[in-house]
């Protein structure tokens, strides 16, 4: 009789996870009688993946029906296959014995997997930064195989450059994952802008996989400061406001100190969004100009978002107005956070909102 | 080890009917077909009939067609023979064995059981 | 169906000395490229043992004074130098169609 060939027609197979692979095993002969085995790997570690005479191998089944006479087709299909299944599987014919003795090894055959990269999960600073600095973003991804796969980043669109990707592990593996870091420099324009990470791989039939990130979670624009005069109304009063523009988050403290003194503070809240994601916020106080022998220092006192106070001075001329007699007034604080205070906005402004 | 544990001696009236029981360990059941032989008292081999426990798949030697009857219970490894309508000339040594080579040959035996039919 | 007749159905042979046996058939047994005969050895009071497969294969743990030749129609059990263990019944089956087996040949020491 001629020598028993064991025959794995494939050198490889590739499959993509979830899917079956069928590895391909047919003998030469009926001689000698005894089973076949199916190994992943080679030598004193290998691992048995089926074994067509005892065992429970609930993933694998025999292609060809194993009591069929004349059978010499020892295939085998492996179901819901994962990355962890990649490896090389060898057919390998036993003789019949008490135990079976390992006769002939096929060449074997290389399984690998491909497998979708998870949705890329971008994420970025943990505090925010203010606009003109430069921040950091991550975008990770993992499971997928095989390791060849491409990561962009893009801001609005535009890709960007400052970018660090590294793929791991270095080495051969089951699965494999991405991690990228993108720079990004904000500017005060950037609370509506969003950076996206795109990631392509054999998988995904050039339909890419993104993660976004909004810069609205990582920007912070510091607000403009101006105290101006409104003409004197017939009572005395000077009606000062302090306009305070183009702001983003929403957080922000408004102080006013007369003479140094504290007048009043107030919380913004529910404030309408200007087009570019920025808030505007205007608030008054009214000064009884007769109630003061000298000049009047009034001051807006911003903390915006946890920030340093920023400060803008006014001053407010008495020797300029006739004293009135009887007022032992000081400064009359007519407004609460709603009557004290009057939202302003361009009129441009009034019907855009921002959403996080 | 692949073993094979049949039922224990029966004796049975003619006409009676006899089930004997084959218990296998030491291998996947269902990969193997199971073969029954019998053997009367100083007489030759002779092949009743075959079952895949796969798929409950029988041939029959045409003696026994319309008398005997393969079963097998996967869930617990076990084959049977049942032989109905008995005569006297049906007293004898009863044998399962394991087809391990798909080849319609019979590698592994189990020790037998005897049936003896009298009146 | 095919008939498998072996022959002599007793044999007395000395210890060292070869024993042959023979069975024919009634028709070829050869089918793809396999001649479906096997030889089984059955001692008083067990279970007859696989001792050669597909005409001319030793199962595995038989001594290798047994062999087996033949093709077609024809095949022999040869035992080349008869061992006092050997005595026993031979029986030679065929599964190119559903099994059947040959009468049997006794074997003993002379």
């Known amino acids: 009789e001629e020598e028993l060939q064991v025959i794995q027609p494939e050198k490889s197979v590739s499959v993509a996870a979830g899917d079956s692979a069928t590895l391909n095993c047919t003998v030469s002969s009926l001689i000698p009688v005894g089973p076949i085995q199916w190994f992943r790997g080679a030598g004193p570690g290998r691992e048995l993946i089926y074994n067509l005479k005892e065992g429970h191998f609930p993933r694998v089944t025999a292609v060809s029906d194993p009591t069929k006479r004349n059978n010499m087709d020892f295939s085998i299909r492996i179901s819901n296959i994962t990355p962890a299944d990649a490896g090389t599987y060898y057919c390998v014919k036993f003789r019949k014995g008490s135990p079976d003795v390992e006769l002939k090894s096929g060449a074997g055959t290389e399984l690998s997997v491909r497998a979708k990269p998870s949705a890329p999960v971008v994420s970025g600073p943990a505090v925010r930064a203010t606009a003109e600095h430069t921040v950091s973003f991550t975008c990770e991804s993992h499971g997928f195989s095989p390791r060849d796969i491409t990561l962009k980043w893009f801001k609005n669109g535009n890709e960007l450059s400052d970018v660090q990707t590294n793929v791991d592990p270095a080495g051969k593996s089951v699965s494999y994952s991405i991690r990228s870091t993108a720079r990004v420099l904000l500017t005060r324009r950037d609370v509506h802008s969003q950076v996206i990470c795109e990631v392509a791989h054999v998988t995904l039939q050039g339909d890419p996989l993104r993660g976004t990130a909004n810069l609205s979670e990582a920007i912070r624009v510091p607000p403009f400061l101006e105290v101006t005069q409104q003409s004197m109304r017939a009572d005395n009063q000077v009606n000062v406001t302090c306009q305070v523009t183009k702001f983003y988050p929403q957080r922000l403290q408004l102080t006013w100190l007369e003479n140094g003194n504290v007048s009043r503070t107030e919380m913004a809240s529910a404030l309408p969004e200007n087009k570019d994601g920025t808030y505007n916020w205007t608030s008054w106080l009214l000064v009884n100009v007769s109630a003061h022998r000298d000049d009047v220092k009034l001051t807006c006192q911003v903390e915006h978002d946890g920030q340093p106070a920023v400060n803008k001075s006014f001053s407010v001329k008495v020797s300029a107005h006739p004293k009135e007699q009887g007022s032992n007034t000081a400064a009359e604080n007519t407004g609460t956070n709603e009557r004290g205070s009057s939202d302003y906005k361009d009129d441009d402004d009034k019907h855009h909102h921002h959403h996080h | 080890q692949v073993q094979l544990v049949q039922s224990g001696a029966e004796v049975k009236k003619p006409g009676a009917s006899v089930k004997v029981s084959c218990k296998a360990s030491?291998?996947?059941?269902?990969?193997?077909?199971i073969n029954w032989v019998r053997q009367a008292p100083g007489q030759g081999l002779e092949w009743i009939a075959m079952?895949?426990?796969?798929?409950?798949?029988?041939h029959y030697n045409q003696i026994f067609k319309d008398r005997a009857t393969l079963t097998t219970d996967t869930s617990t490894s076990t084959a049977y023979m049942e032989l109905r309508s008995l005569r006297s000339d049906d007293t004898a040594v009863y044998y399962c064995a394991m087809d391990y080579g798909s080849l319609y040959a019979m590698d592994y035996w189990g020790r037998g059981t005897l049936v003896t039919v009298s009146s | 169906d095919i008939v498998l007749t072996q022959s002599p159905d007793s044999l007395a042979v000395s210890l060292g000395e070869r024993a042959t046996i023979n069975c024919r058939a009634s028709?070829?047994?050869?089918?793809?490229?396999?001649?479906?005969i096997f030889w089984y050895q059955q001692k008083p009071g067990q279970p007859p043992k696989l001792l050669i497969y597909l005409a001319s294969n030793r199962d595995s743990g038989v001594p290798d004074r047994f062999s087996g030749s033949g093709s077609g129609t024809d095949f022999t059990l040869t035992i080349s130098s008869l061992q006092a263990e050997d005595v026993a019944v031979y029986y030679c089956?065929?599964?190119?169609?559903?099994?059947?087996f040959g009468q049997g040949t006794k074997l003993e020491i002379k």
């Open positions: 028709q070829s047994v050869r089918s793809s490229g396999y001649n479906w």
């Open positions: 030491g291998y996947t059941f269902t990969n193997y077909w």
């Open positions: 079952i895949d426990p796969s798929d409950s798949e029988t």
């Open positions: 089956q065929h599964s190119r169609e559903l099994p059947t």
